[in-house]
């Protein structure tokens, strides 16, 4: 076990922030708390990439290039706190990715490639207090799916291009319900709605033809 | 590790405001939460609010909703809580503390004692 | 809010004593629990995490137990530089809550 040889380790801190880095390093002590990844040149998260790592607190992949994620590459990270994926080529959250991570509380996933949300994302996620979706390629999201985020204090929605069709009356219902969405989330279409916050927009003008 | 530095002792009139700031050092806290607490002479621990600098957007306890305003300069990689409308109740050390999560303290600042008189 | 009792308020020991802090919440909190100590004229220090995780650099003569309303800090054999206020907090629900503190005084 050791600290990778670009990086500095510290009070079960591991810092790689800037290194060049293509993969997650591997052999890292078991005891850490933190590993900080960002603005590297990792483009694959495998399977099992932190599971050795039972007490992780914080990662923080931001600004890699990061398009593959294994379903299983935070598997028992059940102390994890904050996971920070912002800035990177995601295009889907596989299944079961978030599973058992109950103590998380930040969810960064802002400018990345998502295009769908399966419904049962987000699960387990009944601490998540932030979960930031901003400038994704969403164009609607599932009746259900932030059902599980019970402690949801913060969400940002904006930046994606939303259809706001009667697939998404929920979500206007949702937003009046918790104005938690301070983004400023709006439609992309049709275009009697374009432009328009959807959290402010009459439920009964999400329509399908 | 992120350090925190703060900005020096304030005394302050009744009915003005004040602004304490928050300095990173030996590392960026872009993407952490960073919070305000603040300590009465003798007394416990109050949680203010916190913010998350690349998001911009804070959140704030009830009690100081209105009162406090907690902001983050990016550039420079500093946070200020900004609080106004003192009263002498509000003598008290504002610290500010950054951690994993929203709500848990790693690291803390050195404190600044703000003192409300006339 | 969630509130946070400490018991006692203060107590005194002696050096190599076994000092058991408690720490009641006003509803579950599941393990969302942290422990910090604070000493005179300094920002408090982070202890525990997650009810019973010990914060790198924290002598293991600190440990910490219980889930859901009932929590437990304990120093099995106090030294000098333990003499100080402990906090326990809850970090499951917004707004993070402490509890009133426990002082811990030379016998």
């Known amino acids: 076990l050791h600290c990778p040889a670009a990086c500095t380790c510290s009070n079960n801190i591991v810092d790689c922030r800037g290194k060049g880095l293509t993969e997650i390093p591997t052999n890292l002590p078991e005891t850490i708390t933190e590993i900080r990844l960002e603005q590297n040149t990792i483009k694959v998260i495998p399977p099992g990439a932190f599971s050795p790592y039972k007490k992780l607190r914080r990662i923080d992949l931001s600004n890699n290039q990061i398009s593959e994620l294994a379903p299983d590459a935070f598997q028992g990270l059940r102390s994890l706190n904050s996971l920070v994926l912002y800035g990177n080529k995601i295009t889907e959250l596989p299944k079961s990715l978030f599973e058992g991570l109950f103590s998380l509380q930040l969810l960064l996933l802002n400018a990345n490639k998502i295009n769908c949300l399966r419904v049962d994302a987000f699960q387990d996620l009944h601490n998540l207090n932030l979960l930031s979706l901003y400038d994704n390629k969403l164009q609607t999201i599932a009746k259900g799916t932030f059902s599980p985020l019970r402690a949801i204090q913060t969400m940002h929605l904006a930046q994606n291009p939303f259809i706001c069709d009667c697939h998404l009356k929920w979500l206007a219902d949702y937003l009046h319900t918790n104005p938690i969405e301070t983004s400023g989330a709006r439609c992309t279409s049709p275009r009697r709605l374009a432009n328009k916050r959807i959290g402010q927009i009459k439920s009964k003008k999400f329509r399908c033809s | 590790q992120v350090q925190l530095v703060q900005s020096g002792a304030e005394v302050k009139q009744p009915g003005s405001s004040v602004k304490v700031s928050c300095k990173a050092s030996g590392g960026s806290f872009r993407s952490y939460t960073v919070s305000w607490v603040r300590q009465a002479p003798g007394q416990g621990l109050e949680w203010m609010g916190g913010i998350i600098p690349i998001f911009g957007t804070a959140n704030y306890a009830q009690k100081f909703q209105g009162r406090v305003t907690i902001t983050a300069d990016e550039s420079t990689d500093t946070v200020y809580m900004d609080l106004s409308s003192l009263k002498s109740e509000n003598t008290a050390v504002y610290y500010c503390?950054?951690?994993?999560?929203?709500?848990?303290?790693?690291?803390w600042g050195q404190g600044t004692l703000v003192t409300v008189s006339s | 809010d969630i509130q946070m009792t400490q018991s006692p308020s203060s107590l005194s020991a002696s050096i190599g004593d076994r000092v058991t802090i408690t720490c009641r919440a006003s509803?579950?909190?599941?393990?969302?629990l942290n422990w910090y100590q604070q000493k005179p004229g300094k920002a408090p220090k982070f202890l525990i995490y997650?009810?019973?995780n010990l914060q790198s650099g924290v002598p293991s003569r600190f440990s910490g137990s219980g889930s859901g309303t009932d929590f437990t800090l304990t120093i099995s054999s106090l030294q000098p530089e333990d003499f100080a206020i402990y906090y326990c907090q809850q970090s499951y629900r917004s707004p993070p809550t402490f509890g009133g503190g426990t002082t811990v005084e030379i016998k």
């Open positions: 503390a950054t951690g994993s999560g929203w709500y848990t303290f790693d690291y």
């Open positions: 509803q579950n909190i599941n393990s969302y």
């Open positions: 997650a009810a019973s």
